[in-house]
Interface confidence: low
């Protein structure tokens, strides 16, 4: 015998309380396939989520993120804060720690400044949270004990890098 519920189109549910009549999904619910015995509750895009597509009787709402945030996960299940240049998202918010930089807008992670000494080069321009160190040409001769003071832009003091 054919299941009478199979005749119920998307946007309805097969209502056992009404002798398996196809009843329209109540407000704020949907069924995207035929033959459903219940309608699913519409997703609500609240807070940092905003509505990209309204819920209809046959399809769920779709969310994206408010400005300053971007989607993560299947179907935009999470909104993650956009970080500016010079920042990455940490538990404490958007920032780059000393000695690291991020030159991308909205994405990316903070990477350590280039260690110029590994290539036998001097520091031509100090790094910032947004820009990497600029290394100069290779140093022809130097004393291994020489230190230079590197002060990040806007930073209160310096710290030493062994070159």
């Amino acid at each position: 015998l054919q299941d009478p519920c199979s005749n119920c189109p998307a946007g309805t549910f097969c209502d056992n309380n009404r002798n398996q009549i196809c009843s329209p999904c109540p407000p704020n619910s949907f069924s995207s396939a035929g033959g459903q015995r219940t309608c699913d509750i519409c997703r609500q895009c609240k807070g940092v989520f905003r509505t990209r597509k309204e819920c209809s009787s046959t399809s769920n709402a779709e969310c994206d993120c408010t400005p300053g945030f971007h989607c993560l996960g299947a179907g935009c299940s999470m909104c993650e804060q956009d970080c500016k240049q010079g920042q990455e998202l940490t538990k404490k918010g958007c920032k780059c720690s000393l000695g690291t930089f991020n030159d991308q807008n909205g994405t990316g992670v903070c990477r350590p400044w280039t260690n110029c000494s590994l290539d036998g080069r001097s520091v031509l321009k100090t790094g910032t949270t947004e820009k990497d160190v600029v290394c100069g040409p290779p140093v022809v001769s130097f004393s291994p004990s020489t230190t230079i003071s590197v002060t990040p832009e806007g930073g209160p003091g310096g710290h030493s890098l062994q070159v």
Epitope: Q2, S6, P9, G11, G35, S57
Partner: antibody, heavy 117, light 107 residues
């Protein structure tokens, strides 16, 4: 996006049987119903009948004895057959998708059928 | 079968006018009424379902109201692209039936 396309013979002789096909793309016939509607020249819309996702049908009571609606889910096609045609069956024939809130949200562009000898 | 009667059968209005089309059912149909627009080229589109719910993409100048046996489609400010024939359709009882249509023209 969802599209419905009717195809028919154009010209049919009186007393013959009309056969029209509605091909559905972008939507499953196992999730939606398809309703047939016709419009005689210069007149209004007339519902002919519907086939539901599970395959059962409902027909316009005045035309029930002459109408058969069937479908092939695998081909995404719905067919309308109407027997014993007369000049009064000359019309534009439309198929339309039926959603669960009982409206026709997508319509085909229609196919013209002329019954004449 | 439930009979649906529309009035007027045709009307002519000026751009920017407020236009109302009436639809009457031969018996009570609660709010189970839809409105469709048929353009001169034969294209049919859903405008409003369940008496007053605007279908997606339909301009907000269209609205619907009513309950029971008497229903109204209103266009708040007539635009050139609104030239069409408008049909009401009941879905309270099978077979679903249409009104006779209202042909709307611009003066």
């Amino acid at each position: 996006q969802v599209q419905l396309q009717e195809s028919g013979p154009g010209l049919v002789k009186p007393s013959e049987t009309l056969s029209i096909t509605c091909t559905v793309s972008g939507s499953s016939l196992t999730s939606y119903g398809v309703h047939w509607v016709r419009q005689p020249p210069g007149k209004g819309l007339e519902g002919l009948g519907v086939i539901w996702p599970g395959g059962s049908t409902n027909y316009n009571s005045a035309l029930m004895s002459r109408l058969t609606i069937s479908k092939d889910n695998s081909k995404s096609q719905v067919s309308l057959k109407m027997s014993s045609l007369t000049a009064a069956d000359t019309a534009m024939y439309y198929c339309a998708r039926v959603t669960g809130t009982w409206y026709f949200d997508v319509w085909g562009q229609g196919t013209t059928v002329t019954v004449s000898s | 079968d439930i009979q649906m009667t529309q009035s007027p059968s045709s009307l002519s209005a000026s751009l920017g006018d407020r236009v109302t089309i009436s639809c009457s059912a031969s018996q009570g149909i609660s709010n189970y009424l839809n409105w469709y627009q048929q353009k001169p080229d034969g294209t049919v589109k859903l405008l409003i379902y369940y008496t007053s719910t605007l279908h997606s993409g339909v301009p907000s100048r269209f609205s619907g109201s009513g309950s029971g046996t008497d229903f109204t489609l209103t266009i708040s400010s007539l635009q050139p692209e609104d030239v069409a024939t408008y049909y009401c359709q009941q879905y309270s009882k099978l077979p679903w039936t249409f009104g006779g249509g209202t042909k709307l023209e611009i003066k």
